[in-house]
């Protein structure tokens, strides 16, 4: 579209500077080495090019790299990294946190692209994991990242990773993903105190197991309702209703608002209404005194 | 000194087609794009589209695109604007507007009114 | 498209004043915004191309600032034959977006 015979006489360029920004696409073309182009890449992103011009520099770069851009090159890309499509990326070999970044911060403020997850995916797997740093900086630009990647990528991810990540990086995990990064993030701040501990460990507990929530039931935590609906429905159901009220502290009066959702509601279920009377949150639908309950599961196992 | 010419008003009917035209003066065309530009009455300015009179590449607004047909004549050193379709909607003043490689418009014809009536 | 608001529609000011016009862009345009004067019964004269250049013959109280989506035009010593509409218009991008515009009014 935009090829051109010759450069007109006293166009050719002899550096990049601001200059090329008043050529026309063909006269771009025509006028700018590749090599020129290639080693002051890191003027183009000083030089307001637009959208349009862009093209023809990526052209010109892809002419004199089919195999994909050194890293020199892809660090100072800038602006021209918008033009790049997943298949340009596929073929880059990104091993520099400072290259991530400086490409990342060219796209912030918008969704994450098909070419951000390409480059994202590129650099993680050079790196062999997810390694604190990146992760640090995956979720500064990208809060959630982390819930964009399957349970078996997020194996990868090292409990010392675990520091980096904030509540909100994990708002759309589902329980897979958490079943994952609760027991990364258990082992993390395993040396911290009980107050502490919890702070940390809160927005991880969509993936404790019964067993870790009857243990901090006998921390005094106030777990508030809202993590507690989080909570995985198998892990809540074996919770009597006094591990319950030691769990939730003062919250246990939200449970009357939540008694038609899960988990509160199977776990009412499997209670006796005897005993989710003493809360006196007219909670209903107990087993009634004098049935008795056989754990069906547990006869299974032994048979 | 710089300018640029538009061709006098039109008073054209509804369905019909006109062809505006944008003759340049102290400055070869073929140096720049030329750009169209819609301004309604009392509304702001709309982009058209525009063109590189020296190969006839030309970019629209995806608004005029089958609307709008820019062609330019670097012998006579002028670009048209071929409207289609008419209706009261196209009633307006069109500008053209030369500008280098950024896109931007430095110099503007006076304007041509189109009036789209029965 | 990325669109260019100017949100004020008017703006007064008085002989001597100095007022600033602004344009926020729908996303990142970098520099590549241009503003134009456009008074009564006339086509519109470039006043500031790139963001804070100022074109030949323009005099320098018309003065051009901002990058990426906030751009401002600032007339200081605003004068009489200033009364004029002013529009932004980003040419970062096709198709190429105006912004509103905004009428000067002198008081």
């Known amino acids: 579209e935009v090829e051109k015979t010759a450069c007109p006489s006293g166009k050719k360029a002899r550096e990049i500077d601001e200059s090329l920004i008043f050529y026309k696409k063909w006269e771009l073309e025509a006028c700018v080495d590749a090599a020129l182009l290639a080693t002051q890449m890191d003027r183009v992103n000083a030089i307001p090019f637009t959208y349009e011009q862009l093209d023809v520099l990526k052209h010109k770069l892809d002419e004199l790299y089919p195999q994909g851009y050194p890293e020199s090159v892809i660090q100072h890309l800038g602006y021209l990294f918008l033009k790049m499509s997943p298949e340009d990326i596929r073929k880059w070999n990104v091993t520099s946190l400072e290259t991530l970044k400086a490409l990342l911060e060219v796209n912030k403020g918008h969704e994450m692209s098909p070419q951000v997850a390409t480059l994202i995916d590129r650099f993680v797997k050079g790196r062999g994991q997810l390694d604190k740093d990146t992760l640090d900086t995956l979720t500064a630009f990208y809060p959630g990242y982390l819930c964009s990647l399957s349970p078996e990528e997020l194996s990868s991810v090292p409990p010392s990773s675990i520091w980096a990540v904030r509540p909100q990086d994990l708002d759309t995990c589902d329980p897979r993903q958490l079943d994952v990064l609760y027991p990364k993030a258990r082992l993390a701040f395993q040396n911290m105190n009980g107050s502490e501990y919890f702070v940390k460990i809160q927005s991880f507990l969509g993936g404790a197991p019964t067993e870790d929530l009857k243990a901090l039931s006998q921390q005094n935590v106030s777990m508030d309702l809202a993590t507690f609906m989080k909570l995985r429905t198998d892990a809540v159901l074996p919770l009597t209703v006094a591990e319950v009220q030691k769990l939730l502290g003062p919250h246990v009066e939200g449970l009357k608002a939540e008694e038609r959702h899960r988990p509160v509601r199977d776990w009412i279920l499997r209670q006796r209404q005897d005993d989710l009377d003493t809360l006196g949150l007219g909670l209903q639908g107990g087993i009634p005194n004098g049935y008795l309950v056989l754990d069906l599961s547990m006869q299974e196992a032994l048979s | 000194e710089v300018q640029l010419q538009q061709s006098g008003a039109e008073l054209v009917k509804p369905g019909a087609s006109v062809k505006l035209s944008c003759t340049a003066s102290a400055f070869n065309i073929k140096d720049y794009y030329m750009h169209w530009v819609k301004q309604r009455t009392e509304q702001g300015l709309e982009w058209i589209g525009r063109?590189?009179?020296?190969?006839?590449?030309?970019k629209y607004a995806p608004k005029f695109q089958g609307k709008a047909t820019i062609t330019a004549d670097t012998s006579s050193n002028t670009a048209y604007l071929q409207l289609s379709s008419l209706t009261s909607e196209d009633t307006a003043v069109y500008y053209c507007?030369?500008?280098?490689?950024?896109?931007?418009?430095?110099?503007w014809g006076q304007g041509t009114s189109v009036t789209v009536s029965s | 498209d990325i669109v260019m608001t100017q949100s004020q529609k008017f703006m007064s000011t008085s002989v001597g004043d100095r007022v600033s016009i602004t344009c926020k862009a729908s996303?990142?345009?970098?520099?590549?915004v241009g503003w134009y004067q456009q008074k009564p019964g006339q086509s519109p004269k470039a006043l500031i191309y790139l963001a804070s250049n100022r074109h030949t013959g323009v005099p320098d109280r018309f003065t051009g600032s901002g990058s990426g989506t906030d751009f401002t035009l600032t007339i200081s010593n605003v004068q009489s034959e200033d009364l004029a509409d002013y529009f932004c218009?980003?040419?970062?991008?096709?198709?190429?977006?105006f912004g509103g515009g905004t009428k000067l009014v002198i008081k």
């Open positions: 218009l980003q040419h970062w991008n096709s198709p190429y977006t």
């Open positions: 063109i590189d009179p020296e190969d006839g590449e030309t």
């Open positions: 507007a030369s500008g280098s490689g950024t896109g931007a418009m430095d110099y």
């Open positions: 996303q990142n345009v970098r520099t590549a």
